[in-house]
């Protein structure tokens, strides 16, 4: 090890100036008692390097870079050994940005698989190894004391979102949760959030069903549909209101919406549609008067309008 | 503070019929789906039935289907159990209980005891 | 129907004991799985719901984990008035079942 780099800092800000320093030792015999140190960044050759000889016989050159302009380059110090280049050191340089505040942080409470989910916006590139990391701490009041500590949610390389498992959630009771983002520049934090994950609560939606025709009832008027909707009964406990939305199945018709409607009709009449024509359904639900969010659209229901012509345009439904 | 009084208890021949009632107060009645769970002398706990926030869901458990119907009045914060055809299985005390959104029975009733024998 | 099996039905334990009940459902319920302390002559009372949440007013020497098909109630340190009947119940779907009951007796 004839030749040794020192750099004021391996990691810098994009476009910023680093100074490197490169030593060789005097008992390094085989080389020509003035070598002339060269400098590289990368592929090319920097001039610029200000060498001297120190009182112990070491041989040292200075470089300043100015600007930075690589968010990774390895600079290397060398001689010239016959006609080759002789590298004696080299180091990796790395210059990007401290991370940006995340933002649009928003979380959701899935109680099929019993974790609050969360999310967020992590912002620009900074062009250095990045970790986010999920924290939180349970809160009885608005979240302006702290009460315990959950443990840190580290996401998987690359992804914005992560799980905290139901074992580490209190239902019914404030959580502080915001997002930290850091790198070798620096540390940021998101906005807090402050909220309870019953108020994240996102629903499965219900499954819409064609009515079974019965004996005593009657058939649907034309341009009317008869649909029921079986709830998803995990969340049956929960108040909610729906929402259909319908589009006939040829065409560019755009969806029309339906609602709201309670949860607990599970039987509906639609009316004032085209006739003999078929339709696509969907429904959604979320809890309410209560606040959540709305679930997923449920799969499609193909339901035909009855051939004559329609008698009547007006939505009603019947419990 | 949340309060369910139940009454209408009492003794009855196989095959008569009995109301129970549940009073509730210190909560908005409206919001919350209702049931009963009985529970017959010495042994655990069985559901019987619930009723959703407005009344429109109401499962029963097989052992009552068809002879129990339950109810509620919101305008008056009471749930009722009618029971009909009542057999000796049947005797129990019966819960009133105030259900949470994740099925969960949050508050109980002090119960109504039901004998039916002849 | 998805049924619910309590184990032990009985236990025998003291002031101060680490106790266990388990409760196992006859399918996956994710976490709809309560939980109920009974007293002779007295209604039941609801201690953890979904799983793992204490009931306010609940102490937290109770504490309920699991999820799916196999779940646990823990009382960390016995005291004297926790001895009595405690009563699992699945909230996934209807029709609700609760377990067959553990009766926790002084030794």
């Known amino acids: 090890e004839c030749g040794h780099i020192s750099v004021s800092a391996p990691i810098v800000h994009l476009g910023d100036p680093i100074t490197a320093s490169c030593i060789i030792k005097q008992n390094c015999s085989h080389l020509d008692p003035e070598p002339q140190i060269l400098w590289r960044l990368g592929a090319e050759l920097q001039p610029g390097g200000r060498q001297q000889r120190l009182s112990d016989g070491t041989q040292e050159s200075i470089i300043t870079l100015p600007h930075l302009n690589h968010t990774q380059a390895f600079l290397s110090c060398a001689l010239n050994w016959g006609n080759s280049l002789q590298i004696l050191d080299q180091v990796e340089l790395r210059a990007g940005y401290p991370p940006a505040i995340p933002h649009n942080l928003s979380c959701l409470m899935n109680l099929t698989t019993s974790s609050l989910i969360c999310q967020w916006e992590p912002g620009p590139e900074t062009h250095l190894p990045t970790s986010f990391t999920l924290k939180s701490f349970k809160s009885r009041g608005n979240c302006q004391t702290q009460g315990d500590s959950i443990l840190d949610c580290v996401p998987k390389d690359g992804q914005s979102h992560c799980s905290i498992p139901r074992k580490h959630l209190l239902l019914y009771q404030n959580m502080g949760i915001w997002v930290q983002a850091e790198n070798a520049l620096g540390t940021s934090m998101s906005p807090q959030l402050c909220l309870d994950p019953m108020d994240v609560v996102k629903l499965e939606p219900p499954m819409l069903r064609t009515m079974d025709p019965s004996p005593e009832a009657a058939p649907p008027q034309a341009g009317c549909l008869q649909l029921s909707w079986e709830p998803w009964q995990p969340g049956l406990h929960i108040n909610q209101k729906c929402e259909l939305r319908h589009k006939p199945q040829r065409g560019e018709a755009s969806w029309a919406l339906v609602g709201p409607l309670p949860l607990e009709a599970l039987q509906y009449e639609l009316c004032g549609l085209l006739p003999a024509t078929a339709y696509t359904l969907q429904i959604r639900c979320i809890r309410w008067p209560l606040p959540g969010h709305w679930s997923d659209w449920s799969p499609s229901l193909e339901l035909r309008t009855t051939e004559r012509a329609p008698t009547h345009h007006h939505h009603h439904h019947h419990h | 503070e949340v309060q369910l009084l139940e009454s209408g208890g009492g003794l009855v021949q196989p095959g008569g019929s009995l109301r129970l009632s549940c009073a509730a107060s210190?909560?908005?009645?409206?919001?919350?789906?209702m049931g009963w769970v009985r529970q017959a002398p010495g042994k655990g706990l069985e559901w019987v039935s619930s009723?959703?926030?407005?009344?429109?869901?109401?499962p029963y458990a097989d052992s009552v289907k068809g002879r129990f119907t339950i109810s509620r009045d919101n305008s008056k914060n009471t749930l009722y159990l009618q029971m009909n055809s009542l057999r000796a299985e049947d005797t129990a005390v019966y819960y009133c209980?105030?259900?949470?959104?994740?099925?969960?029975?949050?508050?109980w009733g002090q119960g109504t005891l039901v004998t039916v024998s002849s | 129907d998805i049924q619910m099996t309590q184990s032990p039905s009985s236990l025998s334990a003291s002031v101060g004991d680490r106790v266990t009940i388990t409760c196992r459902a006859s399918?996956?319920?994710?976490?709809?799985l309560n939980w109920y302390q009974q007293k002779p002559g007295k209604a039941p009372k609801l201690l953890i719901y979904?799983?793992?949440n204490l009931q306010n007013g609940v102490p937290s020497r109770f504490s309920g984990s699991g999820s799916g098909t196999d779940f646990t109630l823990t009382i960390s340190s016995l005291q004297p008035e926790d001895f009595a009947t405690y009563y699992c119940?699945?909230?996934?779907?209807?029709?609700?079942?609760f377990g067959g009951g553990t009766k926790v007796e002084i030794k």
């Open positions: 979904y799983a793992s």
């Open positions: 399918q996956g319920i994710s976490s709809y």
């Open positions: 009723i959703s926030s407005s009344g429109g869901v109401t």
């Open positions: 209980a105030k259900l949470g959104e994740l099925g969960q029975y949050m508050f």
């Open positions: 119940q699945q909230s996934f779907y209807y029709p609700f079942y």
């Open positions: 210190g909560f908005t009645f409206s919001l919350y789906w």
